[in-house]
Interface confidence: low
C-alpha cells in the first residue's frame, strides 16, 4: 500500500467574524495507526487546536465521525470565529509511539484570513469646554477590523473636514487593527446645535459605515453679554435697573448685584429663555429706593458663567435727579428691594 | 512514580448521595482522560463515566442523570458525585487514566469499596 | 451498545503452558481494543491496547492479535504469578464495555 498522504485542499480560506470555518482534511491510508491532531502554525510554538484522542474542544466540531478507526476524512469545523483565529492551519498525522505520539506526516497547510467589522467609531472631544474662534481637538478611535484597509472621513454638520490625522495600528500584519484619528475644529458662536461625526467605511459593511457623532455643545462656552439699564421709575422713589445677560452657553450661571462694591444680593439663573442658535438669554433686576441714598450710587451686574472668571458691567444711578419727598425718611426702608427675575 | 488513590467510598442508603474522590500523582494530570470503573463484589468490571481533557463528559446508560464526573486539574483531582444510589450501585469504584493515543486505561487506582444498603 | 464476549469463562492450565484466550465483540471496534489482567482484591493492570500493543514494563510473553471483531490473547509460557482473571474491553464507542471476564487456574 502507498503511504499515507495528508491532503489539505484549500491554501487559504476567507471567513466573516463570527461565522464558522471548515478546514478540509482527508489521508488516503489507515495506515499507521495514529490520531490526526490540527495545529495553527508550524514548528515548536504551534497551537494545539484539535487532537482526535482527546475528545471535545469547545468549539471545534469533526465533519466525519473520528471515533471510527476507518474514517479517512478529518476535516474540522471551527465555530465564532474571531480575528484572533486567523493564521495558517495545518493537519497532522501521528504514528503511535512510545513514550510519545510520532509526527508521521503533515497536510501543506490552510490560510485562515478572518474578516471583522470595526467597532463603532468613539469620538471624544477636548476635556474642559472652549470659547469661540479657538481650535479645539476631537478624537475618533475605532477597533478590532480586519483586513487592515480602512477609510475615515470627519465631517461637521454634513461637511466634511480636511484638518485631520489617521493612524492605523499595527503597521505590521496582526490578526486585528485599530484606527485613530484626531480632527481640528475651529468653534463658532453658533455651534452649540452642531455635530462633529466621525465615518468609518470598511469592506466588512458592505457600503453602510459606522459613524460616531460628538455633540459641541459638550466642548463649547459661549461667554455672555452683559447690558445694564435703568427702567422708567414704578413708584414714588423706586427705580427698576435691569442686568440683561444675553447669548450665554451652557446655562450654568450666577449673577451678584453690587451696591457701590457691595454685595447686595446673589442668585442663580432660573427660567432661562433659549436662543434659536442654542444659548439663553436672561434678566434680573433690582427696585433701588432713592430716597435712602444721598449721594450717586454705583450698581453693579456682576455674572460668573460656567465657573469662569466673574465679568461684570455697571451702571451709575443719580441720586440728584430724583426729588425727595419731606418727612419721609425719618425712618427709611431697605435701600435696594429684593426683586425676582421677570 | 504514576498513582492513583481513591477515597469516599462507604456505606450509604438507597437514594443517598456519594462523592468519590482520585487524588493522582506522578504525570501531568491536566494532560489524559480519566475514568471511572466498578467492579461488583465477585463479578465483572463496568464503565461508569470519562471526562476528556477539555471536561466533556460521557455515561452509560445505567447511571446517567444520576452520575456526573469533574475534575480540577490544579488539584489532580478526579471525583465522581453519585446521586440516587441504587443497591445495584454496590461495587468497588476504580479510578483510571487514558494514558495512550487510543485512551486505553493504562493506570489504575486501588478501589473504593461503594456499598449501598438499608 | 457493543457486546463483548470473552471464551473460556474459565481455564485451567499448568505452569509453562502456553494458553489463548478469545474476545469476540458484536460490530466492528476497529482494532480499540484493551486486555487487562486482575487478581482478586487488586485493580486491574493493563496488559494490551490497539488489539496487539504491549503496554509499557509488562512482559514480552503477552501478546494481543485480531482485528474487527474478533481477538486473541495468548500467554506464551506460564508462570505462577499468570494466574488471574483477564478482562477484553472495547473502548471504539461510548459506552466502553468489558468482556465478562475469563479465570485462569493452576491445574
Known amino acids: 500500500e502507498e503511504e499515507l498522504q495528508v491532503i489539505q485542499p484549500d491554501k487559504s480560506i476567507s471567513v466573516a467574524a463570527g461565522e464558522s470555518a471548515t478546514l478540509h482534511c482527508t489521508v488516503t491510508s489507515l495506515i499507521p495507526v495514529g490520531p490526526i491532531q490540527w495545529f495553527r502554525g508550524a514548528g515548536p510554538g504551534r497551537e494545539l487546536i484539535y487532537n482526535q484522542k482527546e475528545g471535545h474542544f469547545p468549539r471545534v466540531t469533526t465533519v466525519s465521525d473520528l471515533t471510527k478507526r476507518n474514517n479517512m476524512d478529518f476535516s474540522i469545523r471551527i465555530s465564532n470565529i474571531t480575528p484572533a483565529d486567523a493564521g495558517t492551519y495545518y493537519c497532522v498525522k501521528f504514528r503511535k509511539g512510545s513514550p510519545d505520539d510520532v509526527e508521521f506526516k503533515s497536510g501543506a497547510g490552510t490560510e485562515l484570513s478572518v474578516r471583522a467589522k470595526p467597532s463603532a467609531p468613539v469620538v471624544s472631544g477636548p476635556a474642559a469646554r472652549a470659547t469661540p474662534q479657538h481650535t479645539v481637538s476631537f478624537t475618533c478611535e475605532s477597533h478590532g477590523f480586519s483586513p487592515r484597509d480602512i477609510t475615515l472621513k470627519w465631517f461637521k454638520n454634513g461637511n466634511e473636514l480636511s484638518d485631520f490625522q489617521t493612524n492605523v495600528d499595527p503597521a505590521g500584519d496582526s490578526v486585528s487593527y485599530s484606527i485613530h484619528s484626531t480632527a481640528k475644529v475651529v468653534l463658532t458662536r453658533e455651534d452649540v446645535h452642531s455635530q462633529v461625526i466621525c465615518e468609518v467605511a470598511h469592506v466588512t459593511l458592505q457600503g453602510d459605515p459606522l459613524r460616531g457623532t460628538a455633540n459641541l455643545s459638550e466642548t463649547i462656552r459661549v461667554p455672555p453679554t452683559l447690558e445694564v439699564t435703568q427702567q422708567p421709575v414704578r413708584a414714588e422713589n423706586q427705580v427698576n435697573v435691569t442686568c440683561q445677560v444675553r447669548k450665554f452657553y451652557p446655562q450654568r450661571l450666577q449673577l451678584t448685584w453690587l451696591e457701590n462694591g457691595n454685595v447686595s444680593r446673589t442668585e442663580t439663573a432660573s427660567t432661562l429663555t433659549e436662543n434659536k442658535d442654542g444659548t439663553y438669554n436672561w434678566m434680573s433686576w433690582l427696585l433701588v429706593n432713592v430716597s435712602a441714598h444721598r449721594d450717586d450710587v454705583k450698581l453693579t451686574c456682576q455674572v460668573e458663567h460656567d465657573g469662569q472668571p466673574a465679568v461684570s458691567k455697571s451702571h451709575d444711578l443719580k441720586v440728584s435727579a430724583h426729588p425727595k419727598e419731606q418727612g419721609s425718611n425719618t425712618a427709611p426702608g431697605p435701600a435696594l428691594a429684593s426683586a425676582a427675575p421677570l | 512514580e504514576v498513582q492513583l488513590v481513591e477515597s469516599g467510598g462507604g456505606l450509604v442508603q438507597p437514594g443517598g448521595s456519594l462523592r468519590l474522590s482520585c487524588a493522582a500523582s506522578?504525570?501531568?494530570?491536566?494532560?489524559?482522560?480519566m475514568h471511572w470503573v466498578r467492579q461488583p463484589t465477585g463479578k465483572g468490571l463496568e464503565w461508569v463515566s470519562t471526562?476528556?481533557?477539555?471536561?466533556?463528559?460521557y455515561f452509560p446508560g445505567s447511571v446517567k442523570g444520576r452520575f456526573t464526573i469533574s475534575r480540577e486539574n490544579a488539584k489532580n483531582s478526579l471525583y465522581l458525585q453519585m446521586n440516587s444510589l441504587r443497591a445495584g450501585d454496590t461495587a468497588v469504584y476504580y479510578c483510571?487514566?487514558?494514558?495512550?493515543?487510543?485512551?486505553?486505561?493504562?493506570?489504575w487506582g486501588q478501589g473504593t469499596m461503594v456499598t449501598v444498603s438499608s | 451498545d457493543i457486546q463483548m464476549t470473552q471464551s473460556p469463562s474459565s481455564l485451567s492450565a499448568s505452569v509453562g503452558d502456553r494458553v489463548t484466550i478469545t474476545c469476540r465483540a458484536s460490530?466492528?471496534?476497529?482494532?480499540?481494543l484493551a486486555w487487562f489482567q486482575q487478581k482478586p482484591g487488586k485493580a486491574p493492570k493493563s496488559l494490551i491496547y490497539?488489539?496487539?500493543s504491549l503496554q509499557s514494563g509488562v512482559p514480552s510473553k503477552f501478546s494481543g492479535s485480531g482485528s474487527g471483531t474478533d481477538f486473541t490473547l495468548t500467554i506464551s509460557s506460564l508462570q505462577p504469578e499468570d494466574f488471574a482473571t483477564y478482562y477484553c474491553?472495547?473502548?471504539?464507542?461510548?459506552?466502553?464495555?468489558f468482556g465478562q471476564g475469563t479465570k485462569l487456574e493452576i491445574k
Open positions: 483510571a487514566r487514558g494514558g495512550n493515543w487510543d485512551d486505553a486505561l493504562d493506570i
Open positions: 506522578g504525570f501531568t494530570f491536566s494532560s489524559f482522560d
Open positions: 471526562i476528556g481533557i477539555a471536561g466533556d463528559t
Open positions: 460490530q466492528d471496534i476497529n482494532n480499540y
Open positions: 490497539t488489539a496487539s
Open positions: 474491553q472495547q473502548y471504539n464507542t461510548y459506552p466502553y464495555t
